[in-house]
């Protein structure tokens, strides 16, 4: 269909609360395009019906709630006046309850649901929500270990949580709870977040810290278009390179005949503490010889790999 | 609908105390925090402080500590300011303004206070 | 205190252009988590303010999308794209990223 394939990373979600994916990928976004999502490849778009409990608002994919069959890759396609790219988005839902110690902990748990304070200072925690601008969000409460925050050195500020003067007792496991109201109809967003204590005033030492790729595989079909990040955070004034090599050599002196492989340009954004760069590496085509090479992102001394495999056959479909 | 309904204009001498109220209706009162503002005559808008309705705690800008009292009755979904002391430099419009997942979503008509002798 | 300051004035627009309005900040109002804590307020003739964005570039639901906000950690500006005569005002700028709250002083949009 002439649709180029990208992978983007998995989400793993709460089961019975809303949730949503906004299919952006700048700079094919930017421009007059049109996006439809499909979901586990099938060729009926999902619904734009606002009373289905799945459907697809504007560029978003929205579940009210997602449930536990909804497991699976969602595909959103963008098509501009010259373009067709296919966004596949890995999506696993878990019954979480967050107050029931004897569950443990997540896999995989993304930084939104890991943060830090900083012992002795005022810090804050932030609740991350993101939801189409039909989804109207209210006030939102906190908990630590169950129970609603209260107290002086709590104060809660649109979407954080303020903390002066942190203690080591305020580490573990606090939770956002804020109500959306979709259409008339409200529901319930809890996200639990995990937070640990760091002693140290800035953002940390000169070592960067790779934050993606974390030394997996990632399963990707032959012939498609892959496309992966590393996100690296560093402090202000680093002086480290960041680059992918592959065999040990940059991918784009390795592949400078082909040029199938490319390093793509770096970006940061700046943080009061610290910058996030990101650099990604583009496979304009999967071939087998691919399969098995550990493709390295490197920051500084810091080190992480991805290895492309292909997927386990689907002896469903025979 | 949200909305916050203010009290009316007041005019009082030098010295003096005010009590503005604002009535909330239209959503769940002990759910969101009150802010007053205020906005003096060719000035920009200051914030005075806001109050948490559930419990009753507030906080103030450091310049307006003393000044005004923020207060709650939850019964009667309304929120008070009491102002003390009152000088000329006092006389301004007064806003009650909610806040919950965003600040100062919706504000009251506002109040005007002229202190005069 | 984090101080917000804006011009008085714009340059006075005529109906249908774009016009700009810009604010900045004594202190940058990108945190940590990524969110720039800087919201935009009209306040019309005889009117209470209006909240028209937060957090830099989120239009609040049932405000026209002629309305958009960009920027800076430091310095940010409100776009309107088509402006309409209902758009005259006084925009303010305040910063939500920490206690006290600060606006700026505000900036008079005029027509031509």
């Known amino acids: 269909d002439g649709c180029k394939d990208i992978f983007m990373k998995n989400e793993i979600l709460s089961a019975s609360q809303p949730f949503a994916f906004n299919c952006t990928f700048p700079p094919i976004t930017s421009g007059e395009v049109s996006v439809t999502w499909y979901k586990n490849s099938s060729k009926i778009p999902v619904s734009k019906i606002i009373q289905s409990r799945i459907h697809q608002d504007e560029t978003w994919i929205l579940f009210l709630p997602m449930e536990w069959g909804d497991s699976g890759v969602y595909q959103c396609v963008i098509k501009g006046r010259d373009s067709c790219h296919r966004i596949h988005v890995n999506l696993t839902v878990f019954e979480k309850h967050w107050c029931d110690t004897s569950i443990g902990g997540l896999p995989n748990l993304s930084d939104e649901y890991k943060q830090i304070l900083h012992l002795g200072k005022d810090d804050s925690l932030t609740c991350h929500l993101h939801f189409p601008k039909s989804c109207v969000l209210g006030p939102i409460k906190w908990y630590k270990d169950c129970n609603e925050i209260k107290g002086e050195r709590f104060t809660v500020l649109e979407t954080r949580l303020l903390v002066s003067n942190v203690s080591a007792e305020d580490r573990g496991n606090y939770a956002c709870q804020a109500i959306l109201t979709h259409s008339g109809k409200q529901y319930e967003v809890l996200n639990g977040i995990t937070v640990s204590i760091t002693e140290r005033a800035g953002y940390g030492g000169s070592v960067p810290k790779i934050i993606y790729p974390k030394n997996h595989s990632i399963e990707v079909q032959l012939g498609t278009t892959l496309i992966v990040d590393c996100n690296v955070t560093d402090t202000k004034d680093n002086t480290n390179l960041r680059c992918w090599r592959v065999n040990n050599t940059l991918v784009d002196d390795y592949y400078d005949e082909s040029k199938r492989i490319r390093e793509g340009v770096e970006t940061h954004v700046s943080f009061r503490e610290h910058n996030l760069y990101t650099v990604n590496i583009t496979f304009l085509e999967v071939k087998m010889e691919d399969y098995g090479l550990p493709f390295m992102c490197h920051a500084g001394v810091s080190t992480a790999y991805i290895i492309l495999q292909l997927p386990a056959p689907d002896f469903r479909a025979y | 609908e949200v909305q916050l309904q203010q009290s009316g204009p007041e005019l009082v001498k030098p010295g003096a105390s005010v009590k503005m109220s604002c009535k909330a209706s239209?959503?769940?009162?002990?759910?969101?925090?009150m802010n007053w503002v205020k906005r003096s005559p060719g000035k920009s808008l200051e914030w005075i402080g806001r109050i948490n309705p559930d419990y009753g705690d507030a906080r103030y800008d450091q310049k307006f500590k003393g000044k005004a009292t923020l207060t709650v009755d939850k019964s009667l979904s309304t929120a008070y300011m009491q102002l003390n002391r009152l000088t000329y430099e006092d006389s301004a419009v007064y806003y009650c303004?909610?806040?919950?997942?965003?600040?100062?979503?919706?504000w009251g008509q506002g109040s005007t206070l002229t202190v005069s002798s | 205190d984090i101080v917000m300051t804006q011009a008085a004035f714009s340059n006075p627009v005529s109906l249908g252009t774009s016009a700009s309005i810009s604010c900045r900040s004594s202190k940058s109002l990108l945190h940590s988590d990524g969110i720039t804590y800087l919201s935009w307020y009209l306040q019309r003739p005889g009117q209470s303010p209006q909240l028209l964005i937060y957090r830099m570039s989120n239009l609040v639901s049932g405000v026209p999308d002629r309305f958009s906000g960009s920027g800076s950690g430091t310095d940010f500006t409100l776009r309107i794209s088509r402006v309409e005569a209902e758009d005259v005002g006084v925009y303010y700028c305040a910063q939500t990223l920490e206690f006290p709250l600060t606006f700026g002083a505000g900036t008079k949009l005029e027509l031509k």
């Open positions: 303004a909610r806040d919950g997942y965003y600040v100062f979503d919706y």
């Open positions: 239209g959503y769940t009162f002990t759910d969101y925090h």
